[in-house]
């Protein structure tokens, strides 16, 4: 039976403090979990890598729309 | 945690308009995809509109296109949604929506709603 009480919930203590060109993003997902000290965006980029931000950085609102309107674009 | 509550909502004529307002206190604004659905009576919830973070780009479904306008003032913390033409099949509940998650115009992308406002069009 899924014990999804108890799934571990992932954190950010710290940003980045660079600014990551869209290019290199592939996805984010929002850390919005009470038990976490901070709000946060987890940007995964092409190579898999996954990036803390801060969600209240220009450059981080930009970077979500972006990936957001790629959501709606077919994948040829 | 995002607040939502909407405002606005009433009875109308058909081809009358009505602004739909939604403020939202707690987490950074800003940084939320903001989107308009609805319900009708027996219906299933559907999409109508949404705009981006930046206010920069607008979405609409087919349904409203032309007839209704969303925007969003990220210094005092709203989205409305300007409805225009207002047709009897537009009645329904209107909900404010966050989204938080990677996505567009997809409910489940939406981690925070509003309680919904009651907009009725009379023929």
């Known amino acids: 039976q899924p014990d999804a009480i108890n799934a571990p919930v992932t954190c950010c203590y710290n940003f980045t403090n660079r600014k990551i060109s869209v290019q290199r993003l592939a996805s984010y997902r929002r850390i919005t979990s009470s038990k976490c000290p901070k709000e946060a965006v987890i940007f995964k980029t092409i190579v898999a890598k996954e990036i803390c931000a801060d969600p209240k950085q220009k450059w981080v609102q930009d970077s979500m729309d972006h990936l957001d309107k790629q959501t709606q674009t077919p994948k040829t | 945690e995002v607040q939502l509550v909407e405002s606005g909502g009433g009875l109308v004529q058909a081809g009358g308009s009505l602004r739909l307002s939604c403020a939202a206190s707690?987490?950074?604004?800003?940084?939320?995809?903001m989107g308009w659905f609805r319900q009708a009576p027996e219906k299933e919830r559907e999409f109508v509109a949404l705009?981006?973070?930046?206010?920069?780009?607008?979405f609409y479904s087919n349904s409203v296109k032309g007839r209704f306008t969303i925007s969003r003032d990220n210094a005092k913390n709203t989205v409305t949604l300007q409805m225009n033409s207002l047709e009897p099949e537009d009645t329904a509940v209107y909900y404010c929506?966050?989204?938080?998650?990677?996505?567009?115009?997809?409910?489940?992308?939406?981690?925070?709603w509003g309680q919904g406002t009651q907009v009725t069009v009379s023929s």
């Open positions: 707690g987490r950074t604004f800003s940084s939320y995809r």
């Open positions: 929506a966050a989204g938080a998650q990677m996505g567009w115009a997809e409910a489940s992308t939406y981690d925070y």
């Open positions: 705009i981006s973070r930046s206010g920069g780009t607008t």
